[in-house]
């Protein structure tokens, strides 16, 4: 912690200005009034403070605003944002997208994923829902950041906004997030023609149920292997060899490359070997001919 000293008269600070980079840590602590700092935060980012000096300034703001900074201060944090922890950010109430943009720009190139995720969460809470303007801001200034939101927060996305989401924005989304987003995407794109629908829905298919995957297999979509590998394991396992062949079309050959990886490996284990042989890919590990398949899960459910 910064030691307390009195401020030498010649070092008294009446405005936040360039001279402060020549102040030692203890001089900053003694001479900078926290309220002055808060009022002139817009000047701080132009001044190339050292990380140590920024620590002192953060300490001053923390003392002034123990319940969390007001948005007027947050908007102008600039490089001071790099000093914030997720715990600090959780105390904030942020509604302005200008504030979000400013801080996303600052965080670029720094390991700030936890802080950015928390910031975005605070913006969604502050604005009441994940509206189109917020999604547009995220896709423009922080590709992939959409996936930092919890499924609960993502559930506030109106289907009308889904069109603004690009494939790369979903790259880091997990299954639980896609479970939330997929039904919204399905709704958003429901009036499109088959091929156009597939192009739009493809990035969201990691959240699709078996029925929808089966339906796609009837539509000559020629799903690429990358998309297939992102499908939920539970959605892939019930598919027949014929359905997978139809679904992948010419890309079916890729199954050989992926045969050791989930969900392909798990799917192979559930298929009859002679069905797999019809693909002519040399896939091994299917159920040998003549074996009886018992679905124990049904028996367990009845007992």
């Amino acid at each position: 912690d910064v030691e307390r000293t009195t401020c030498p008269p010649e070092k008294e600070v009446h405005e936040i200005d360039e001279s402060l980079i020549f102040y030692k840590k203890r001089e900053l602590e003694a001479c900078v009034d926290a309220a002055l700092l808060a009022a002139q935060m817009d000047r701080v980012d132009a001044i190339p403070f050292t990380y140590e000096q920024l620590d002192v300034l953060k300490h001053k703001l923390d003392e002034l605003y123990p319940q969390g900074y007001p948005e007027s201060v947050i908007r102008h944090l600039g490089h001071l944002f790099l000093k914030m922890s997720p715990e600090d950010i959780r105390k904030w109430n942020v509604t302005s997208l200008e504030t979000l943009k400013a801080l996303l720009k600052v965080s670029k190139g720094h390991e700030m994923s936890a802080q950015v995720a928390t910031l975005i969460d605070r913006v969604v809470v502050g604005r009441g829902q994940l509206d189109k303007d917020t999604v547009d801001t995220l896709t423009a200034f922080c590709p992939g950041c959409l996936c930092s939101l919890s499924p609960e927060r993502l559930s506030s996305v109106p289907p009308s906004v889904i069109g603004a989401v690009r494939p790369q924005d979903l790259d880091t989304c997990g299954p639980r997030q896609l479970d939330v987003l997929y039904p919204k995407a399905r709704l958003a794109f429901q009036n499109m023609s088959g091929s156009e629908y597939f192009v739009k829905i493809r990035p969201f298919l990691g959240g699709a149920p078996t029925e929808d995957v089966k339906a796609l297999s009837q539509q000559n979509v020629s799903m690429d292997l990358a998309t297939f590998m992102k499908l939920r394991r539970e959605a892939v396992l019930p598919l027949t060899v014929a359905e997978v062949q139809k679904l992948l079309g010419p890309h079916v050959e890729g199954l050989k490359v992926e045969e050791q990886h989930s969900p392909v490996r798990d799917w192979i284990l559930k298929q009859r070997q002679d069905d797999l042989d019809t693909l002519g890919l040399g896939l091994q590990g299917g159920i040998p001919n003549g074996y009886l398949i018992l679905d124990l899960s049904v028996r367990e459910a009845l007992s």
Partner: antibody, heavy 123, light 112 residues
């Protein structure tokens, strides 16, 4: 465009004071600091002091007892006053803008200079 | 105070030649976290100094790309790749990491 224009006397009596005004245009003193530098054949370029955008000052310790820098933001003027001049204070005196600003980013070089005020200390 | 030592004092060159000026400081010019406030100025006869390079290697606006700066810590160099007639004058290095700011004694670039 950025300009710094200096006005002040060319001749000063020994033990008297020197006052120079630097009038700036093309930028605001709210955002930029202004340095004072002098140049003499014997001592080369010497940094005398600076008034920062917020009004605070830093002086070269060798001149602190007899130097004062102030400004009037609304008139875009910076005032330099040095007391008790002696013959070895004979030099060309310059005002210069501090590089970068509170709007952009500061880099603490002197990016634009005044035309200079030639000062001779002699009786 | 930080002493800035420039070499050579005088540098005779032919037009089109490369020129190199060295500047050494008596202590490190790295300001606590990374920024190094070492700058180069050119003063032509009868004129005020003009900023050429700031923070070691950044060319100021309007400065031709034949000027380049390099170095770190206490040792710095200004290079002119192909000297032109308009480049003649006195070159000064200066530091603004420590107060008081200080200047080198100057290097006069002149025609051989």
């Amino acid at each position: 465009q950025v300009q710094l224009k200096q006005s002040g006397p060319g001749l000063v009596q020994p033990s008297q004071s020197l006052s120079i005004t630097c009038t700036v245009s093309g930028f605001s003193l709210f955002s930029y600091g202004v340095h004072w530098v002098r140049q003499s054949p014997g001592k080369g370029l010497e940094w005398l002091g600076v008034i920062w955008s917020g009004g605070s000052t830093d002086y070269n310790a060798a001149f602190i007892s007899r130097l004062s820098i102030s400004k009037d933001n609304s008139k875009s003027q910076v005032f330099f006053k040095m007391n008790s001049l002696q013959a070895d204070d004979t030099a060309m005196y310059y005002c210069a803008r501090n590089g970068g600003s509170m709007i952009t980013t500061l880099y603490y070089a002197m990016d634009y200079w005044g035309q200079g005020t030639s000062v001779t200390v002699s009786s | 105070d930080v002493v800035m030592t420039q070499t050579p004092l005088s540098l005779p060159v032919s037009l089109g030649d490369q020129a190199s000026i060295s500047c050494r400081s008596s202590q490190s010019l790295v300001h606590s976290y990374g920024n190094t406030y070492l700058h180069w100025y050119l003063q032509k006869p009868g004129q005020s100094p003009k900023l050429l390079i700031y923070k070691v290697s950044n060319r100021f606006s309007g400065v031709p790309d034949r000027f380049s700066g390099s170095g770190s810590g206490t040792d710095f160099t200004l290079k002119i790749s192909r000297v032109e007639a308009e480049d003649l004058g006195v070159y000064f290095c200066s530091q603004s990491t420590h107060i008081p700011f200080t200047f080198g004694g100057g290097t006069k670039l002149e025609i051989k």
